[in-house]
């Protein structure tokens, strides 16, 4: 069971300092941006991180949404990352959900975060280069200290 608590506005960056944004095709991508670029590209660079109470002791449960024309929420259904047109629900009556991730602070690195899928244990949001694009994907942690699954989250409110 997950019960919604509060939400905050955040900018999410990978460890190469690239900013996560949602492009015109609704794809989550990372790109080099100055602070003014980041502001100019809002609301596509501003993510709504909604926190949820979890009935099990597993960590800070969150959804990640973005509001352009409508609100879309990040999903990892079938281990494929996409934004679905939906509001983060007030309650989820299940112990797993494709839209719930556990936001974890990496021990020894308080400012570095990981997002583990509640549906697929051991799978994390990651940044992966594909041709010229840096894409947000879901990835099984396959090596210790994998930097691609670490992010910084900067609160904007």
């Amino acid at each position: 069971y997950f019960g919604k608590l509060e939400s905050k506005l955040s900018v999410i960056r990978n460890l190469n300092d690239q900013v996560l944004f949602i492009d015109q095709g609704n794809r989550p991508l990372f790109e080099d941006m100055t602070d003014s670029d980041c502001r100019d590209n809002a609301p596509r660079t501003i993510f709504i991180i909604s926190m949820y109470k979890d009935s099990q002791p597993r960590g800070m449960a969150v959804t990640i949404s973005v509001k352009c024309e409508k609100i879309s929420t990040l999903s990892c259904e079938n281990k494929i990352i996409s934004f679905k047109e939906m509001n983060p629900p007030d309650n989820i009556k299940d112990t797993k959900s494709d839209i719930i991730f556990f936001q974890r602070s990496v021990p020894g690195h308080d400012n570095k975060m990981q997002f583990e899928s509640s549906s697929y244990e051991g799978y994390f949001l990651a940044c992966e280069k594909e041709r010229d694009l840096f894409k947000l994907i879901l990835k099984k942690e396959d090596e210790l200290g994998d930097r691609s699954i670490m992010f910084t989250v900067q609160n904007e409110d």
Epitope: L5, K53, P57, R58, M60, R104, S105, P107, G108, D110
Partner: antibody, heavy 120, light 110 residues
């Protein structure tokens, strides 16, 4: 770097209560669970319970301590408290607070410990 | 009596590799991650290994963790005198709905 600083040693009479504090500095206090773990002289570690200030002060206690322990937090001062009542000699121990930032059960930061001695 | 079972003591000479075991059941280690803590004499415990085999930054790679079935182990290679400490394993126990520690293993560097 987060630091947890605990209150000083206490000597208490059997039947009384003790309240130990744990002040956090250098991090986001209300995002993480704070657990309390005790260690009797020459013995191992024993988990007592946690508070998750982020979850509006949600607490969870180990069965053994239920009814006797109360864990609270004051967000304004980034301080967690553990109160243990009906003290007996077996409660003589070092009491540690521990922060869990990665997972509620991964104690990645510990206070220095507070020795509580229960003696008549 | 601890829910997780560790040998009370272990020893080795400098440079050696030592392993400390932690045995549990399906209600704890069998279905949950294992963490390891090091407690140097007179100090608070310190997180050494989390999530079976992950090291926090600052922990030397001489320390490694593994898990198989309902048991876990901590390996220390290239043993050094400063490794002399108590080591505790920890897991979640569904039957008691609480986190549990092993009884601790006192490591002596001869």
């Amino acid at each position: 770097e987060v630091q947890l600083v605990q209150s000083g040693a206490e000597v208490k009479k059997p039947g009384s209560s003790v309240k130990v504090s744990c002040k956090a500095s250098g991090g986001t206090f209300n995002s993480y669970a704070i657990s309390w773990v005790r260690q009797a002289p020459g013995q191992g570690l024993e988990w007592m319970g946690w508070i998750n200030p982020f979850y509006i002060g949600e607490t969870f206690y180990a069965q053994k301590f239920q009814g006797r322990v109360t864990i609270t937090a004051d967000e304004s001062t980034s301080t967690a408290y553990m109160e243990l009542s009906s003290l007996r000699s077996e409660d003589t121990a070092v009491y540690y607070c521990a922060r869990a930032a990665y997972h509620p059960l991964v104690f990645d930061n510990w206070g220095q410990g507070t020795l509580v001695t229960v003696s008549s | 009596q601890s829910v997780l079972t560790q040998p009370p003591s272990a020893s080795g000479t400098p440079g050696q590799r030592v392993t400390i075991s932690c045995s549990g059941s399906s209600s704890n280690i069998g279905n949950h991650y294992v963490n390891w803590y090091q407690q140097l004499p007179g100090t608070a415990p310190k997180l050494l290994i989390y999530r079976n085999n992950h090291r926090p930054s600052g922990v030397p790679d001489r320390f490694s963790g593994s898990k198989s079935g309902t048991s876990a182990s901590l390996a220390i290679s290239g043993l050094q005198s400063e490794d002399e400490a108590d080591y505790y394993c920890q897991s979640w126990d569904y039957s008691g709905f609480s986190t549990v520690f092993g009884g601790g293993t006192k490591l002596t560097v001869l």
